[in-house]
């Protein structure tokens, strides 16, 4: 509900300065609020545009000031007024000199419709005129001046709605500056009654409270609080929750409250006069010092809470025995709740007695809607009321209230809740690279939309088309791996991040597809890679009987050791073999194989070969004789990589013997290193020579080795080798 | 925790009377107006009386006009339906609630008059 | 008096859909000068009295689950379920209260279909 008070301060105008203030209390009103001149109330006032600056002292509050050497500008009637959602509430009051000819008994009086009413005025200055009401502005009544009495009145014998206006007083010779006002507000209803038809019956408004005729709901006092008014507010305070404070020094003296009709104006509890600056006498409390205490067992009478009950006892005169009443308090509600769009759960809690009830908690947004719990739950001290709100979104973001009315009393509790956009990533994750079950991603979350810091991120993955729930990964770094995946199946990615706090999980970004490979074939069987020219090589493989019907070939991928030279071919599937050539001579390749389909195969081993040499071999190296024995002696030798040597031919004879009588003993396998010469006749100096043969010819070997066997009886000899020139 | 607790009820011939109770608890009884409400076997809801906080002001339903009272003892936070001259059209469920405005808020537990011969 | 008629007399919907009751007024029970409808509707389950759930035709009571709106004005209104659940099986009732007597229509029975 609106809670809306406008503070006069003063309404008798002297030479002090004089002020109106309007405060929306507990509640954010959707327009500003209005302070402005009522010239419905009193149309020849001042015309004077009024100077409204924002109260520094409250949050929801609008003032104006006028300065003591304005006096004379201020008489008249002035309204405040405020909206929230649609409906408008306005206060009225008004302004007089102090110096004026009449004032009046009250700044207001309401009244209900029917009842017998005396508006009354009280002579301050007697002059020799005739005395003049008027209502609205409008003159209705004069006195002759010898019969003006000591107190002007208008009676309304049986007072209707339309009776209802700011009645005014002066001499005939004065002026709207000399007069003055007050304000008579006519309840459309008869007395208890509310309602469009008048026939509901009004709770009791306690302490002075009045029953709205729209809607039977108490009006209350400033002091008292509650359904029905009877509990009464801390020392100093006022509104509908007690929450706003007096912050004179002496509390409320001196402030008129003025109230939504058909409360009108009134001194806070504990004070009276038309400038509330006098203290209720003994006996008696409450707005005007109006309400008589009537203390059932002699207790204390406090002139603003009224009876001060012994415990044990309560009720307006402590009529009544129990736990006395305790005003609830809203308990473990932070200032200040960050909170992330989507649903959210907010808890009020509060104490009291008695415990408030769930009908009794309520929640009250930035735009003024109320809401009631979802769900509640009490303890001996506490009450927890949980509301739900399926969709917060930021423009909710503001001042919300949490509010418990109960019989002891009511509390407000505003704090704010600043709702964040969950983020979410602008562009879709990017696939790097990809295999038969693995795939990496840069997770691309910058930028993103919403708000941060992003407290974790996921990589959502799951295959596409398959009825399967989203998996995901926690990632801390851009770049990830996804393992584990399923050959040659498209999958669709996105990439959720998180903020800080409950529900902070935002909606996953931009999906990325992509396409595992499919496992690949294995890699042809049987490979050889042999030496075709000094240019060429072939490769051969086995015939391949793919397992599916999907095409397939052969590639090749050949690469120089020697050179940075590489180079891919495909052959098609039916063949088993492939010419490598355009390659140079003397150069050792390596080649390797795989059969491709849609997906690429598994790579054979390397295979190295040379092609053939294009110059005559060198000699071979390193040639040793050992185990010498009387017929046999063992020839080992080392020869170089490269030269396409395809064979070997040790060459030996005795000594002295002519060239043609010599023994060629060729070995075919280049690559044994030794071999054992047998047959030889004991004590014998044979001469060995050894030649390496290619593509090209044989070595020329620089010089022979000498041989002698043993005689017959001798352990086997090593020799070094002894060189013999040619 | 606001409650209203019925008694009273039970089996009476066409012509007699019978006295129905609500004891209130929970909340200032004596600042609240009160009503009884009833509601025949079967059948829908029928408003039937209300009084003031204070006791001063009752209102009835024409159907029951002249032969129930309503009364209340706000020392005793109690609420009483007279009801003289039963008919058996009287025969009903009868509740007594508290108003938040116009609407009935708390409604107590109800109480089963048979009016039957 | 101001008549209330409510329709359907009985009303099956299946768990989860929606479900709406009407409520018309034999005159306006709009207040022009607050522009408020005095019009409350209650639940009532078997042995059970009556329960608020709405007033001012469209406020809903404390602990009335946001699944339950009301709305219209003047002389036509209505009540909805946006979801119903299993545990909303009952008689409904509108009440107006813009004129005493407080009247009430004669209800309107909700069944899972």
């Known amino acids: 509900a609106m809670d809306l008070i406008l503070i006069n301060s003063l309404p008798l105008v002297s030479d002090a300065e004089t002020s109106l203030t309007c405060i929306a209390s507990g509640w954010r009103p959707h327009e500003p609020i209005t302070i402005g001149r009522d010239f419905e109330a009193l149309m020849n006032q001042h015309q004077d545009p009024l100077e409204v600056t924002q109260d520094v002292t409250r949050e929801w509050a609008k003032k104006v000031v006028w300065k003591r050497e304005k006096a004379s500008k201020i008489n008249g009637a002035y309204f405040c007024e405020g909206r929230v959602r649609g409906e408008a509430i306005r206060i009225r009051t008004m302004k007089m000199r102090q110096q004026a000819s009449f004032l009046p008994a009250t700044l207001t009086m309401t009244v209900d419709k029917g009842d017998n009413v005396n508006i009354s005025f009280k002579k301050v200055l007697i002059k020799e005129e005739d005395a003049v009401i008027y209502k609205n502005g409008s003159f209705i009544h004069s006195v002759p001046r010898h019969e003006v009495p000591d107190i002007l009145e208008v009676h309304l014998p049986h007072a209707q709605p339309q009776d209802a206006g700011v009645y005014s007083a002066r001499y005939i010779g004065g002026n709207l500056f000399t007069s003055a006002f007050t304000r008579l507000i006519v309840r459309r209803c008869e007395a208890q009654k509310w309602g469009p038809e008048c026939n509901h019956l009004c709770t009791a408004c306690m302490n002075n409270g009045v029953c709205h005729e729209d809607t039977g709901e108490c009006i209350c006092p400033p002091g008292f609080m509650g359904r029905t008014c009877e509990k009464a507010c801390e020392l100093h305070t006022f509104g509908r929750t007690c929450k706003e404070r007096c912050s004179g020094q002496e509390g409320c003296k001196s402030y008129v409250f003025c109230l939504p009709d058909p409360y009108g104006c009134s001194c806070a509890t504990g004070w009276k006069g038309l400038q509330c600056n006098e203290a209720c006498h003994p006996g008696f409390y409450g707005p005007d010092c109006k309400l008589r205490c009537s203390c059932n067992n002699g207790e204390m009478c406090d002139r603003f809470q009224g009876c001060l009950c012994s415990p044990g006892w309560q009720g307006l005169q402590c009529e009544r025995e129990g736990i006395p009443r305790m005003t609830p308090k809203i308990v473990d509600l932070p200032d200040h709740i960050e909170v992330n769009s989507g649903k959210f759960n907010p808890i009020c809690k509060a104490s009291g007695w008695p415990l408030p009830t769930n009908e009794e908690m309520t929640l009250v947004k930035p735009d003024g809607t109320v809401l009631h719990p979802k769900d509640f739950n009490h303890t001996d001290h506490f009450s927890v009321a949980i509301f739900t709100i399926h969709r917060i979104l930021p423009p909710d973001s503001g001042v919300w209230v949490c509010s418990v009315n109960t019989v002891a009393g009511m509390v407000e509790k505003p704090f704010n809740i600043s709702v964040k956009v969950l983020p979410k990533p602008l562009n879709a994750p990017n696939v790097i690279d990809t295999g038969h079950n693995f795939a990496v991603i840069n997770i691309s979350s910058e930028p993103y939309f919403g708000d941060g810091p992003i407290k974790s991120k996921k990589l959502l993955y799951k295959p596409v088309n398959h009825y399967e729930a989203w998996q995901h990964i926690q990632v801390t770094n851009e770049i990830v791996t996804l393992n584990y995946l399923e050959p040659r199946t498209e999958y669709e990615l996105c990439v959720q991040l998180v903020r800080r706090g409950e529900g902070g999980e935002g909606h996953p970004g931009p999906v990325r597809r992509f396409t595992t490979a499919s496992i690949g074939l294995p890699p042809p069987r049987g490979l050889n890679l042999l030496p075709k020219s000094q240019t060429t090589l072939n490769l051969t493989w086995q015939p391949i009987f793919p397992s599916s019907e999907d095409d397939f070939y052969v590639e090749v991928e050949r690469r120089s050791v020697q050179k940075s030279d590489q180079q891919n071919i495909k052959v098609p599937g039916n063949l088993t073999s492939v010419l490598l050539n355009n390659l140079h001579p003397r150069e050792q390749y390596v080649v390797r194989a795989r059969v491709n389909t849609k997906a690429q195969g598994e790579w054979s081993e390397d295979l190295t070969a040379w092609t053939l040499s294009d110059i005559l071999p060198p000699q071979p190296e390193n040639i040793k004789i050992s185990n010498i024995t009387h017929s046999s002696a063992v020839i080992s030798w080392t020869i170089l990589d490269g030269y396409s040597i395809s064979s070997i031919t040790i060459r030996y004879k005795v000594q002295g013997k002519n060239e043609d009588q010599h023994v060629d003993v060729k070995i075919k396998n280049a690559t044994i290193t030794q071999y054992q010469l047998k047959g030889l006749e004991p004590e014998t100096a044979y001469q060995v020579d050894i030649f390496a043969e290619n593509n090209i010819g044989s070595s020329n070997p620089a010089f022979s080795h000498e041989l002698v066997t043993l005689p017959e009886s001798q352990a086997p000899a090593d020799l070094g080798g002894g060189k013999m020139l040619l | 925790q606001v409650q209203l607790v019925q008694s009273g009820g039970g089996v009476v011939q066409p012509g007699r009377s019978l006295r129905l109770s609500c004891a209130a608890s929970?909340?200032?009884?004596?600042?609240?107006?009160m009503h009884w409400v009833r509601q025949a076997p079967g059948k829908g809801l029928e408003w039937v009386a209300v009084i003031s906080y204070d006791g001063e002001n009752k209102y009835y339903a024409d159907s029951v006009k002249g032969r129930f009272t309503i009364s209340r003892d706000n020392s005793k936070n109690m609420l009483q339906l007279q009801m003289n001259r039963l008919r058996s059209e009287d025969t009903a469920v009868y509740y007594c609630a508290t108003p938040k405005g116009g609407a009935l808020e708390i409604w107590g537990q109800g109480t089963v008059i048979t009016v039957s011969s | 008096d101001i008549q209330m008629t409510q329709s359907p007399d009985s009303l099956a919907v299946s768990l989860g859909e929606r479900a709406t009751i009407n409520c018309k007024s034999s005159?306006?029970?709009?207040?022009?000068?607050?522009?408020?409808?005095?019009l409350a509707w209650y639940q009532q389950k078997p042995g059970q009295p009556p329960n608020l759930l709405m007033y001012?035709?469209?406020t809903r009571e404390s602990g009335v689950p946001d699944r339950f709106s009301g709305s219209g004005s003047g002389t036509d209104f209505t009540l909805t379920i946006s979801s119903l659940q299993a545990e909303d099986v009952a008689v409904y009732y509108c009440q107006q209260y813009y004129s005493a007597p407080i009247t009430f229509g004669q209800g309107t029975r909700l069944e899972i279909k």
């Open positions: 001012w035709a469209s």
């Open positions: 929970g909340l200032t009884f004596a600042n609240y107006a």
């Open positions: 005159q306006s029970v709009l207040y022009s000068s607050n522009n408020k409808n005095y």
